[in-house]
């Protein structure tokens, strides 16, 4: 049975140009994790892997950091950036756990106007 | 669809370095899901896991090889590399390329393979 | 490192009968992380299942994998004459490394 639960920022914002964390974290369950999956819509951003650890993704490795812990940093923001990210946790015996995050990447002058960070 | 072919030496001399590429076609080694290994079968026995490598340059190797074995990346050429040093004849084996799914976790295996090249071991 | 036995060593059985394959851990291996390879004289091996039970692309649905824990079985319902070959089982873990079995031998009756 799955009793865990993924605990996320939410809707978030950010100016382009900029960076932001994303971040999961995964409570109420004493499974094993073996790995973190971080995707937006159906791309492959980045990999955590229990044993092997960080692992970005071809078309993201210049912009995109591991960590911190097992959240992600993404930089030199753009407006495509906007959507949703997805952490995937897979966990043992437990199986998978998903995560989704919103972000809105707003041109500087409205970005400063808003709130940065915005959890529903 | 994406092919694997293993290139070297088909004769090393004991205590020399075998070294073989592995030559990726039909898509790119730049996968972010994928490592790409190396396996061995000596003649007539079983297979055996040599090391893998991520296009990045991360690697993880049998335990029992690692001390003399080192496996490189080059993503300008779609190829990744195994040396192995201080043969002797128990080398003697069909070396394979593969592409190894470690990450892909619920499908963990090695999906698709070289044909193999046979490496002797002698003086 | 985590020892893959499998049984019966050779197999002698006729086209149409049905194969079943054994393959034992010396620990507990996540049946998301085994695998099931058939190779034939001068090839390279090939993935017929993985994840203990789904069918790699291409495979015929008599190949059929089941099992968890240390106990693991590869079955093929009827044998067709392009199925005689050696057949392993591997174990993907990372620590301790990944492993093959020693194999099992399908030949003709």
């Known amino acids: 049975m799955m009793t865990g639960t993924i605990e996320t920022t939410g809707n978030i914002s950010a100016e382009k140009g900029g960076s932001i964390i994303l971040q999961c974290h995964l409570s109420s369950t004493t499974a094993q994790v073996t790995q973190v999956n971080w995707e937006q819509q159906d791309q492959l951003l980045a990999i955590c892997n229990a044993d092997l650890g960080w692992h970005i993704s071809p078309s993201f490795k210049d912009r995109v950091a591991p960590g911190p812990g097992l959240g992600l940093t993404l930089q030199s923001l753009t407006v495509n950036d906007t959507g949703e990210y997805f952490c995937i946790y897979h966990t043992y015996p437990d199986g998978t756990y998903t995560g989704r995050i919103f972000l809105e990447v707003l041109e500087s002058s409205v970005a400063e106007h808003g709130a940065r960070f915005q959890i529903p | 669809q994406l092919q694997l072919q293993e290139s070297g030496p088909g004769l090393v001399k004991p205590s020399e370095t075998l070294s073989l590429t592995c030559t990726v076609s039909g898509g790119s080694i730049e996968s972010g899901s994928y490592y790409w290994g190396w396996i061995r079968q000596p003649p007539g026995k079983g297979l055996e896991w040599i090391g893998s490598?991520?296009?990045?340059?991360?690697?993880y190797y049998n335990p029992s090889l690692k001390s003399r074995v080192t496996i490189s990346v080059d993503t300008s050429k779609n190829q990744f590399s195994l040396k192995l040093s201080s043969v002797t004849a128990a080398d003697t084996a069909v070396y394979y390329c593969?592409?190894?799914?470690?990450?892909?976790?619920?499908?963990?295996?090695?999906?698709?393979w070289g044909q193999g090249t046979m490496v002797t071991v002698s003086s | 490192e985590i020892v893959l036995t499998q049984s019966p060593g050779t197999l002698s059985l006729s086209p149409g009968e049905r194969a079943t394959l054994s393959c034992r851990a010396s620990q507990s291996v996540s049946s998301s992380y085994l695998a099931w390879y058939q190779q034939k004289p001068g090839q390279a091996p090939r993935l017929l299942i993985y994840?203990?039970?789904s069918r790699a692309t291409g495979i015929p649905d008599r190949f059929s994998g089941s099992g968890s824990g240390t106990d693991f079985t590869l079955t093929i319902s009827r044998l067709e004459p392009e199925d005689f070959a050696v057949y392993y089982c591997q174990q993907h873990t990372v620590r301790p490394p990944l492993t093959f079995g020693g194999g099992t031998k399908v030949e003709i009756k």
């Open positions: 593969a592409r190894d799914g470690v990450l892909t976790l619920n499908k963990r295996s090695f999906d698709i």
């Open positions: 490598i991520y296009y990045s340059g991360g690697t």
């Open positions: 994840g203990a039970s």
